[in-house]
Structures are given as C-alpha cells and as structure tokens.
Amino acid sequence: RKIPKVGHTFFQKPESCPPVPGGSMKLDIGIINENQRVSMSRNIESRSTSPWNYTVTWDPNRYPSEVVQAQCRNLGCINAQGKEDISMNSVPIQQETLVVRRKHQGCSVSFQLEKVLVTVGCTCVTPVIHHVQ
Amino acid sequence: GITIPRNPGCPNSEDKNFPRTVMVNLNIHNRNTNTNPKRSSDYYNRSTSPWNLHRNEDPERYPSVIWEAKCRHLGCINADGNVDYHMNSVPIQQEILVLRREPPHCPNSFRLEKILVSVGCTCVTPIVHHVA
C-alpha cells in the first residue's frame, strides 16, 4: 500500500534548497545522531515479568541492513515465584521506523522509503475477558 | 555503507555500497499490514506498568507527530490494583529513523535522523545493590 507523498510546496523555498527532479526527494543517509546510544536499564529483557528475546534481521538491500526484533518468551507473565502465570498476558510493544530499500531493475537501481514495524519489547497486561452469553 | 549484491551482467563501475545521498521516490511504501486489529492500542492502560502518552509534533520532521510513553509509576500494579514498589516500571526505549528537513524548510530535501523514543513500559525485578 502507498501513503500520501512526503514533501510539498507550502514552504517558502530558500535559495539554498537543492534542485530535485519531480516525483522524488533528495535523501542524505548520513544519519544525524548516529552515535547516540540507548541508555535503557540493564538487561530489562530478562528482568521483565514479560521477558523477551532479540533476533536480528539482516537484509543487504535495506538501509540500515540490520533491524532488531523482539519476541515475547511466554504467553503469560512471570510471577514473584519465577513461574509463568497464564492469567496474565505478555504482549509485544511495537514502534514504526523508516528504512531505505534499494531495488534493482535490470542494471538500474532505485531507492524507496519504507515504513517498518519493529517489536521493541514486551509488557504484561491484564487480559480482556469476553463473556459468552 | 552496506554491500549490495550486483547483477553480474551489469557494468563494473556500479558502487556496491549505499551512496551517501540518494534520490528517493516521494511515495513511502507501507510494509506494515497496519490495520492488524490484534495490535491493541489499550496496552498502556492494561499493563502492570501502565504509561501515559505524550504528543510530540515537529513539522520539520517526518513523521511530524510522535506519541511518546512515560511510565505512570515507579513501581508496578499488583493483583489488588495497588502500586508495588518491590518491582519497577521502566521505559522500553527504541532508536528509530525519521526524516529531518535539511536544509530547514526545504520541501523535498531530507536527512535521516536517529531519535530515541520511549515506546511503552515494562515491569522488572529491581537490581539490588548490597552495601558492604
């Protein structure tokens, strides 16, 4: 599926704006804040009551090539005794990010932006109970 | 940059790595089956480490609007619905890529930017430091 276009004409275009062919945009993939690091609490994926594992997906035609995805380890949550409590649910928390896809058409190469959904971790929730009449 | 496998029949001059600057189609492809109804949007209330969502808008960024999570409590909600301070609510953070207009206000010129967002919260056992 396609979503509406990025970019428009409402900006008072400064003279410094680079010329861009119609239907496309210029994208610098030198990342701003490339070296910032996540200061998340230590190994929360193991200490969580809804623990998760990480897997790395790798795609050479994607930038960045590595995308890390989380998977909840259990259906239920871990209780104080370290046992799985199936009266609660471990559920994935997801966030959207952008990637650049490189496409080969014969010997020519084109680039496409994509929205990708990343599972970031898991949280423990009270289940929604549907009462059947 | 990253190495790209090349069609062996293509001229050898092609760069195998991603170039620093690329021209990208204005349409953004949606790889998510975004309307997955299983993907609940009420976890923030039902979680044992509930969070509030704060709206952050920046017209120079794509996406312009990002909703960020802030944990409601230091502790976690127990079976009785009370806050249990023997456990900790902590944010789950993720680095995501967004587009930043560069130069500013230019309609069709962007640079990738990495930003850190808090997506939700999870309940963890605290790390206990024993003082000698």
Epitope: - | S41, Y43, Y62, V65
Partner: antibody
C-alpha cells in the same frame, strides 16, 4: 473517497452522558489522528482534543479535560467521544476531523458532517 | 492561549470586487489555516499552512502573512464565495480558532 460519518443528533437530559461516534472510511485509519471540535453561536469553534488511533494516545484542551473522553476502535475504524455530566453549556454541534500524522502541515483536511447535541430537561 | 482576532466580523462585496480579511494573533505563530463554512454544513479546509490552497479551491483565493498578522484575499468576488471564513492556529496548545469573518454578496 474519504468520509467521516458521524452519529445522529441527540436530545439529552442534564447530568447524563452521551457518546458520539465518527466512522472513518476511504483511508488508512491509523495514519491519521482524530481531532474533535465544538461549535456554538456564543463561543464559535473550539478545539476539544485529539485521539491517536494507532497508539491510543489522547491530548485535551484543558477546558474539556474531564468533560470529554476520546477513544477509537481500530477494528471498525471508528472514533468515539463521550461527554459526561452534561449541562446546557454542552449544547452545540460537535465535529470530528482527521489530521495526518506524517506531514502535519496539511492540517485538519476532512471533517464529519457534525452531531448536534441539545441538553435540556 | 493564543487569541485569534478576525476582522471585519461581517462584510459584503459585489461580484468582481477584491476582498481581504485579516486574522491577528495575540502571539507569534508559524502558520495559519483558513476554513470556509456555509450555513448547515461542516467547515471545509480552504487554505493551509498560510499559503496553500486546498484541493478544489479556486485560484482567485490566496493566503499570506507571518508572525502575528495573516490575511485571506479573494481577487474577484463571486456569489459562491459568500460564507463565513475562520482562521485557525496550531502552533501552541490549546489550538484555537478566530471568531469568523462573514462574507456576504451585495
């Protein structure tokens, strides 16, 4: 084509609550926030608040915090606004409108037809 | 909150006449949005991000301004332009609307 179909007019008693609905069609529901606007002859157009169907996030104009509760159901592409503890001051026409999350300069581009609420004993 | 003051509150113009209405903000804002509303209908987005005409809006309409002073201009009034026009800001919470400028045809 894009449509925001709102529920019908309501005549309600003071002190009660009412829930208005706004069914979206013709676009990806979760790509847009739903904003709600009130219109009266005295106060004109007033922004009530916003609901993000994707995350469930809500943000309110302080004036309507506690008066309105905004929710959305992704499976039916429907947004809801509950108005509580109604008084005659809550009478007016209520509109839902969509707002593109990705490029905010488009603003509130499509509006529902409005729901008229009359609070009277 | 940012107060948007529209003037004139009511105006009338003959067909072919040039029309200008203004919107003054109590604090500086980034962009202004204009909505057209006719009796018994919902507001329609008319001009967005100060300058841009919404889809289907005739080219005789234009928007301009910056900071605290904005305007909507019709180069040559037509009967179908008779309506109330509201300005709107979303630079600061709570988002606010002007009181409206009612444009009538002579």
């Amino acid at each position: 084509q894009v449509q925001l179909q709102q529920s019908g007019a309501e005549l309600v008693r003071p002190g009660t609550s009412v829930t208005l609905s706004c069914k979206a069609s013709g676009y990806i529901f979760t790509d847009y926030e739903i904003h709600w606007v009130k219109q009266t002859p005295v106060h004109g157009l007033e922004w009530i608040g916003v609901n993000d169907p994707e995350s469930g996030g809500t943000f309110y104009n302080q004036k309507f915090d506690g008066k309105a509760e905004l929710t959305a159901d992704k499976s039916s592409s429907t947004a809801y606004m509950e108005l509580r503890s109604l008084t005659s001051e809550d009478s007016g026409v209520y509109y839902c409108t969509r707002y593109y999350r990705y490029e905010s300069f488009y603003g509130m581009d499509y509006w529902g037809q409005g729901t008229s609420i009359t609070v009277s004993s | 909150q940012i107060v948007l003051t529209q003037s004139p509150a009511i105006m009338s113009a003959s067909p072919g006449e040039k029309v200008t209405m203004t919107c003054s903000a109590s604090s500086s804002i980034s962009y202004i949005y204009w909505f057209q509303q006719k009796p018994g209908t919902s507001p329609k987005r008319w001009i967005y991000a100060t300058f841009e005409l919404a889809s289907g809006v005739p080219a005789r309409f234009s928007g301009s301004g910056s900071g605290t002073s904005y305007s909507l201009t019709i180069s040559s009034m037509e009967a179908e332009d008779a309506a109330t026009y509201y300005c709107h800001q979303r630079s600061s919470y709570p988002w606010t609307f002007g009181g409206g400028s009612k444009l009538e045809i002579k």
